[in-house]
């Protein structure tokens, strides 16, 4: 799991690739604060609950972003 | 070298299995996403969908789902291309392509797999 | 699904023409916009990509610009090496896009 507790970042690893964003269970966007300088994306996957972290600066996962996004403004009434 | 090598040419009947293969060689396998386009004969271009090579997490587009299943073997650095139950209309050639993820378009292709299906 | 209208299907040009081809897309696409050669028999090969960024070793007589939903790919001065079919490609969205090609001839 690329998670560290011991940094002061979450992610010690990330990654450039898309997952099917029907397998997110729950995506989080971590702002960059005093205590990690970056913005981190966590995505949490529906199997095994899984977590993986996510470039934001890489398209592909800025794509992903957007079809989370609308995906989720379809659902709200 | 960057290289994606995709298997060769297929004759089935209809009804029968193909099972295509592009292994690659020359980057690290598990780097980027692998895409599946389709071209009919005469005809353009089609993405099918992709498979995340870490994970192994494979993605159809809405045309391709159902028939079709993406996997991998990351041992040999192969992705794989399923498609059952074959109809005439799947007669096409296949085409692997990496996706550069970061910047997210198709840099390196494979050189295409035809299928025939004829009965 | 970003829907994606080339023009025109094809084209015939003398060499030394310059040659114009259009991609649509059906809403704004941000530049995300590449174009690819194909050759009878062979897999398509990346030209530029972000709409106007030139792969290495592809030469110069290839263009492209746009923006919003409108994109344009010129070759300078047509060869004869450069007969082949050329497709956009969006990729502004998960789910990817193709023109529907646009077949070049020399006249």
């Known amino acids: 799991v690329p998670l560290s507790r011991t940094v002061r970042c979450t992610c010690i690893s990330i990654s450039n690739q898309p997952v099917n964003p029907r397998s997110l269970e729950k995506l989080e966007i971590i702002p960059a604060s005093q205590f990690c300088p970056r913005v981190e994306i966590i995505a949490t996957m529906k199997k095994k609950g899984e977590k993986r972290c996510l470039n934001p600066e890489s398209k592909a996962i800025k794509n992903l972003l957007k079809a989370v996004s609308k995906e989720r403004s379809k659902r709200s009434p | 070298e960057v290289q994606l090598v995709q298997s060769g040419a297929e004759v089935k009947k209809p009804g029968a299995t193909v099972k295509i293969s592009c292994k690659v060689s020359?980057?690290?396998?598990?780097?980027?996403?692998m895409h599946w386009v389709r071209q009919a004969p005469g005809k353009g271009l089609k993405w099918m969908g992709w498979i995340n090579t870490e994970i192994g997490e494979p993605t159809y587009a809405d045309d391709f789902k159902g028939r079709f299943t993406f996997t991998l073997d990351t041992s040999t650095s192969t992705a794989y291309m399923e498609l059952s139950s074959l109809r005439s209309e799947d007669t096409a050639v296949y085409y692997c392509a990496r996706n550069y993820d970061y910047d997210a378009y198709f840099d390196v292709w494979g050189q295409g797999t035809t299928v025939t299906v004829s009965s | 699904d970003i829907q994606m209208t080339q023009s025109p299907s094809s084209l015939s040009a003398s060499v030394g023409d310059r040659v114009t081809i259009t991609c649509k897309a059906d809403?704004?696409?941000?530049?995300?916009i590449a174009w690819y050669q194909q050759k009878p028999g062979k897999a398509p090969k990346l030209l530029l990509h972000?709409?106007?960024t030139l792969q290495p070793g592809i030469p110069s007589r290839f263009s492209g610009s746009g923006s919003g939903r409108d994109y344009t790919f010129t070759i300078s001065s047509l060869q004869p090496e450069d007969i082949a079919t050329y497709y956009c490609?969006?990729?502004?969205?998960?789910?990817?896009?193709f023109g529907q090609g646009t077949k070049l001839e020399i006249k």
């Open positions: 809403q704004d696409i941000n530049k995300y």
């Open positions: 972000h709409t106007s």
């Open positions: 020359g980057y690290t396998f598990t780097d980027y996403s």
């Open positions: 490609l969006q990729y502004d969205s998960l789910l990817f896009t």
